[in-house]
């Protein structure tokens, strides 16, 4: 069966199934090294 999980930040489809936020924020700190 075909999968059509919408993951676009401009899409009205759910982004949850991708496991990624619709517009991920930039991390506020950098890891050492």
């Amino acid at each position: 069966s075909e999968t059509t999980t919408g993951t676009s930040s401009n899409s009205s489809q759910s982004t949850s199934n991708s496991g990624l936020a619709p517009n991920p924020t930039n991390a506020t700190t950098k890891a050492a090294g």
Epitope: E2, T7, S8, S9, S18, L20, A21, P24
Partner: antibody, heavy 115, light 112 residues
Framework: EVNLEESGGGLVQPGGSRQLSCVAS????????MNWVRQSPDKGLEWVAQ??????????RYVDSVKGRFTISRDDSENTVYLQMNNLRAEDTGIYYC??????WGQGTTLTVSS | DVVMTQTPLTLSVTIGQPASISCRSS???????????LNWLLQRPGQSPKRLIY???NLDSGVPDRFIGSGSGTDFTLKISRVEAEDLGVYYC?????????FGGGTKLEIK
């Protein structure tokens, strides 16, 4: 059934170039963000690059360590995502996976950067 | 970058017994839409990673309900109520809230 098939890995000398490809089937490719993730014994799993949709103007993101060296692109008509890798370094060695997000993963293609 | 810390490094469990893996993030994974983009993957020996759980607690299709994801903010847990032989491999948490997406170092589940 969703299938992601990577190709293009191999042995490359430091400073060299390589292009990886990933062909997708079983899903509406044009509706998925596409990502490359790599895995090495040293660094474990590391997200490398992402390309979003036409409706997002094909927005692109890279991890800092590959910015300026790697270029991700996609061809929605061919259900294919590419990773052009230039100025390769030993630390780029690893298995490169094509993923839709965290949900679907290919089997990976192995890149070795060594002289 | 958001650092994902998994414990323990290795877990040796008897078949039929429970197992628990912890994942902590250096920043909250709660996104502005109220969802928390914390996912769990299993990499069986010689295979690519396969997702088990997305958005903290949602099981992927075909994943047995003995896998239970929980947590919030920066503190997450994957529990296996009764370990089976097919569960061996390396478990990873991965966050999708912040760029760059980051993975835990992995927890190797061994069968006693």
């Amino acid at each position: 059934e969703v299938n992601l098939e990577e190709s293009g890995g191999g042995l490359v000398q430091p400073g060299g170039s390589r292009q990886l490809s990933c062909v997708a089937s079983g899903l509406t490719f044009s509706k998925h963000w596409m990502n490359w993730v790599r895995q090495s014994p040293d660094k474990g799993l590391e997200w490398v690059a992402q390309i979003q949709l036409k409706s997002d103007n094909y927005a692109i993101r890279y991890v800092d360590s590959v910015k300026g060296r790697f270029t991700i692109s996609r061809d929605d008509s061919e259900n294919t995502v590419y990773l052009q890798m230039n100025n390769l370094r030993a630390e780029d060695t690893g298995i490169y996976y094509c993923t839709t997000g965290t949900d679907y993963w290919g089997q990976g293609t192995t890149l070795t950067v060594s002289s | 970058d958001v650092v994902m810390t998994q414990t323990p490094l290795t877990l040796s469990v008897t078949i039929g017994q429970p197992a628990s893996i912890s994942c902590r993030s250096s920043q909250s994974l709660l996104y502005s839409n109220g969802k928390t983009y914390l996912n769990w993957l299993l990499q069986r020996p010689g295979q690519s990673p396969k997702r088990l759980i997305y958005v903290v607690s949602n099981l992927d299709s075909g994943v047995p309900d003995r896998f239970i994801g929980s947590g919030s903010g920066t503190d997450f847990t994957l529990k296996i109520s009764r370990v089976e032989a097919e569960d061996l491999g390396v478990y990873y948490c991965v966050q999708g809230t912040h760029f760059p997406y980051t993975f835990g170092g992995g927890t190797k589940l061994e069968i006693k």
